[in-house]
């Protein structure tokens, strides 16, 4: 086993240099010291070590710092960041925005989205602020990473970042995340008026409460069915037929194609059939006349 072998005489390196490329893998395991590597990361990056050799260096560093790399080493990682996993990064404590931006630059175009997101999350956990510069440094990574942050981390994301979020970015967000992001979006877009406000806020409406949706229905927004389908069921089922009619405007006709799918189906179940019939769309699944809903999940005959 490589661990048991002793370093051959005359092979103990006192510095990182090109001579190490000649070492066999077991010799690197036996001879190289993790603290020496940490002190000379610039040379580790510069010298043409193979992937195998770099993976041995990483193993040595991991053994030297089992609790996670110190920030002094993280700052010097440079291209070595490419060999670090998201799991490694979760152990780190990063407080310097410059460190984050430098490493994000290294990860750019390297299929390293998971590492980049883990790094930013770790920085936020340490009390850092995700500013627009950092979002730009994250480059082409879809902002879906916002859904990977813990709710606590999300609190330190400035509202201004909401301007950069696109419709698909929130597809995998939990309800709790959506609620928090919706609040942030509301404050980000508070000075935007009319239809422009709706265009901006609609990405976040999956986090809106029934009260918010009622207020929105007063503004002739003509919500499209795709946005409607992203609303959370709990909020949607609290809206009346009249309110949904106002919310969707001419797009109300699109409910028919969605009547057997959630969340439209869930909403239909909570409406009186006679109210649905008034829409003239042939929507089925409402509460039959003469029935009363005593519980959201149980239909009882009214006698």
């Amino acid at each position: 086993d490589a661990e048991q072998k002793a370093c051959p005489p005359g092979k103990e390196p006192y510095k990182v240099d090109e001579d190490l490329i000649f070492y066999q893998n077991w010799e690197l395991e036996a001879c190289v010291d993790g603290t020496m590597l940490a002190r000379q990361m610039d040379l580790v990056n510069e010298i043409p070590f193979t992937y195998e050799q770099l993976s041995i260096f990483k193993h040595k560093l991991d053994k030297t710092y089992p609790q996670g790399y110190p920030e002094s080493l993280i700052q010097q990682l440079g291209h070595f960041f490419r060999y670090v996993s998201p799991e490694d990064i979760h152990q780190w404590n990063v407080t310097s925005p410059d460190t984050v931006k430098t490493l994000l630059k290294v990860s750019k175009g390297q299929k390293m989205n998971a590492q980049a997101i883990a790094l930013v999350a770790c920085y936020l956990r340490g009390g850092g602020q995700l500013d627009e510069d950092m979002v730009k440094a994250l480059g082409d990574i879809p902002l879906s990473y916002l859904c990977d942050f813990s709710p606590q981390d999300l609190h330190s994301v400035p509202s201004s970042v909401m301007w950069l979020v696109g419709p698909q970015d929130l597809d995998k967000c939990s309800q709790r995340h959506l609620g928090l992001l919706y609040q942030k979006a509301c404050s980000a877009f508070q000075n935007v008026s009319g239809l422009e406000y709706f265009e901006k806020i609609k990405t976040f409406l999956g986090g809106a409460s029934v009260k918010d949706l009622r207020a929105l229905s007063q503004h002739n927004v003509s919500m499209d069915i795709a946005t409607f389908k992203r609303l959370q069921v709990d909020s949607l089922v609290g809206l009346s037929v009249a309110e949904v009619q106002k919310l969707l405007g001419p797009n109300i006709v699109d409910l028919k194609t969605e009547e057997d799918k959630s969340p439209v189906r869930d909403w239909l179940f909570r409406q009186h059939q006679k109210d649905l019939d008034r829409l003239g769309l042939g929507l089925q699944g409402g509460i039959p006349n003469g029935y009363l809903v005593l519980d959201f999940n149980v239909r009882e005959a009214f006698s």
């Epitope: 090109e18 001579d19 490329i21 000649f22 510069e46 043409p48 193979t50 992937y51 291209h79």
Partner: antibody
Framework: QVQLVQSGAEVKKPGASVKVSCKAS????????INWVRQAPGQGLEWMGI????????LYAQKFQGRVTMTRDTSISTAYMELSSLRSEDTAVYYC????????????WGQGTLVTVSS | DIVLTQPPSVSGAPGQRVTISCSGS????????VSWYQQLPGTAPKLLIY???QRPSGVPDRFSGSKSGTSASLAITGLQSEDEADYYC??????????FGGGTKLTVLG
């Protein structure tokens, strides 16, 4: 000025071995690694391996592992490359080239040694 | 097996500008410096460009190198008949250590 002078052309039979030398001058021989690169007729360059002249440590391309041996004699500032179990596809010009520390480039080349393998 | 891809040949008339491309991957060009070598007929290769875009002393400024992502290119402006040669890109590879492209034959027309 830096010069790498190689030994003359060789003709060998299949299965035999060949040893090519490369004498360095104009710089401290132990200060730079020596690489060997070959070029088959009408083909591109192919890296074979590298030797550290100070310690004699070597690193070979996987393709040549087990057939190539690189050595050096620091007293006469000369590097050697021996290739065994020769076959016709080893017919090529063999070059030694100095490796420049810090940039990993081949900054000076020998004039080349033609090795012909033929029965 | 060649891991750096070059066009087999390019040509241009005297005075023209030609470029030679060299395509690799993240394990070579993507993470390391590229150098270029010129091999005149019947001679040993000679270093032309190192560290992606640096010229050794004595190399005319008509030769220039550039790199973007996992590709590099060599540009030659004001083409001259003595530029007719084979050109090789080279870098080191994180898997196989040192690599060369397959080489490109430059023909100067006329």
């Amino acid at each position: 000025q830096v010069q790498l002078v190689q030994s003359g052309a060789e003709v060998k039979k299949p299965g035999a071995s060949v040893k090519v030398s490369c004498k360095a001058s104009g710089y401290t021989f132990t200060g730079n690694y020596i690489n060997w690169v070959r070029q088959a007729p009408g083909q591109g360059l192919e890296w074979m391996g590298i030797i550290n002249p100070t310690k004699g440590w070597t690193l070979y391309a996987q393709k040549f592992q087990g057939r190539v041996t690189m050595t050096r004699d620091t007293s006469i500032s000369t590097a050697y490359m021996e290739l065994s179990s020769l076959r016709s596809e080893d017919t090529a010009v063999y070059y030694c080239a100095r490796w420049h520390h810090g940039t990993w480039i081949f900054d000076y080349w020998g004039q080349g040694t033609l090795v012909t393998v033929s029965s | 097996d060649i891991v750096l891809t070059q066009p087999p040949s390019v040509s241009g008339a005297p005075g023209q500008r030609v470029t030679i491309s060299c395509s690799g991957s993240s394990s070579n060009i993507g993470s390391n410096y590229v150098s270029w070598y010129q091999q005149l007929p019947g001679t040993a290769p000679k270093l032309l460009i190192y560290n992606d875009n640096q010229r050794p002393s004595g190399v005319p400024d008509r030769f220039s190198g550039s790199k973007s992502g996992t590709s590099a290119s060599l540009a030659i402006t004001g083409l001259q008949s003595e530029d007719e040669a084979d050109y090789y890109c080279s870098t080191y590879d994180r898997r196989t250590f040192s690599v060369f492209g397959g080489g490109t034959k430059l023909t100067v027309l006329g």
